[in-house]
Interface confidence: medium
């Protein structure tokens, strides 16, 4: 994905741009956006982005806050190309599996689950 | 989604499950399933079930192997249903702010990111 | 403990009409993919009809608009109901089931009954 910088550094940049422009963001009080309701963020990409886009139609545009959705669209940009090698390369069983127990290794122990 | 057992229970008893039947699983030395290239699974979880379907279908079955596929499709249910919560509640650009910088955070913190 | 019995079977003239059941102990219909065989003498095993987990039907090209098959999840019970049956339909007709969570291809069934005799004269 062409970005000047480093994603990471793009993400860190897009949190200080967005706190630099929380008070223009916030302006609409009769906006509502869909927000989740669990902590599992990796999960609803696709809500948050489209809650972005509400956003940003909404948003009166120019100077640093035009930065602010560039960086976001690049990091959609980034989450779209991550998605894309879920299921690029087939191997054996055996690599599935290891695969399959990180995923509920990481399930077991980072998840924020309620029963 | 009705399960005896809490899903972080859920998780660890599947585990132990994987563990125990990774001889029968990795029985079939030709078949080929999709595993992603990175380690941020909660993006690839419709291509990970996909990976449980094609292994199901080819394992003979029978006994706890079942309890285990048995598992999985209740973890399957639970995170379908974490899913359908992504979009649930439509709330202040506020609110909405305060989970897209949580997000960025976790991204920042937790997400293994190559650029 | 796991066991399919079938019944019904029996001798019928060509163009007439037979159904068979297939009872499941030890097991939930909801939890299977079934399906219906048969064998003929000196001929291979081949499955007439079968019924996903998830209720998606598929039946082999002998039997199409002749055959059909139904579960009962109540009963836990399993039915082919054969019309117009012909000669080469005669075979030993056998229900096979497997507990499939993920993928409606039945390419391993674990468990199956014994059978039950299906004879057509023409």
């Known amino acids: 994905i062409p970005t000047e910088i480093p994603t990471s550094a793009l993400v860190k940049e897009t949190l200080a741009l967005l706190s630099t422009h929380r008070t223009l963001l916030i302006a609409n009080e009769t906006l509502r956006i869909p927000v989740p309701v669990h902590k599992n963020h990796q999960l609803c990409t696709e809500e948050i982005f489209q809650g972005i886009g509400t956003l940003e139609s909404q948003t009166v545009q120019g100077g640093t806050v035009e930065r602010l959705f560039k960086n976001l669209s690049l990091i959609k940009k980034y989450i779209d190309g991550q998605k894309k090698k879920c299921g690029e390369e087939r191997r054996r069983v055996n690599q599935f599996l290891d695969y399959l127990q990180e995923f509920l290794g990481v399930m077991n122990t980072e998840w924020i689950i309620e029963s | 989604i009705p399960t005896e057992i809490p899903t972080s229970a859920l998780v660890k008893e599947t585990l132990a499950l994987l563990s125990t039947h990774r001889t029968l699983l990795i029985a079939n030395e030709t078949l080929r399933i999709p595993v992603p290239v990175h380690k941020n699974h909660q993006l690839c979880t419709e291509e990970i079930f996909q990976g449980i379907g094609t292994l199901e279908s080819q394992t003979v079955q029978g006994g706890t192997v079942e309890r285990l596929f048995k598992n999985l499709s209740l973890i399957k249910k639970y995170i379908d249903g974490q899913k359908k919560k992504c979009g649930e509640e439509r709330r202040r650009v506020n609110q909405f702010l305060d989970y897209l910088q949580e997000f960025l955070g976790v991204m920042n913190t937790e997400w293994i990111i190559e650029s | 403990q796991v066991q399919l019995v079938e019944s019904g079977g029996g001798s019928v003239q060509a163009g007439g009409s037979l159904r068979l059941s297939c009872v499941a102990s030890?097991?939930?219909?909801?939890?299977?993919?079934m399906a219906w065989f048969r064998q003929a003498p000196g001929k291979e095993r081949e499955e007439v009809a079968g019924?996903?987990?998830?209720?998606?039907?598929s039946y082999a090209d002998p039997v199409k608009g002749r055959f059909t098959i139904s579960k009962d999840n109540a009963q836990n019970t399993m039915y082919l109901q054969m019309n117009s049956l012909k000669p080469e339909d005669t075979a030993m007709y056998s229900c096979?089931?497997?507990?499939?969570?993920?993928?409606?291809?039945?390419?391993?069934?674990?468990?199956e009954g014994q059978g039950t005799q299906v004879t057509v004269s023409s």
């Open positions: 096979a089931a497997v507990r499939l969570y993920f993928s409606s291809s039945r390419n391993q069934y674990k468990y």
């Open positions: 030890g097991l939930t219909l909801n939890d299977v993919s």
């Open positions: 019924i996903d987990i998830d209720g998606l039907i």
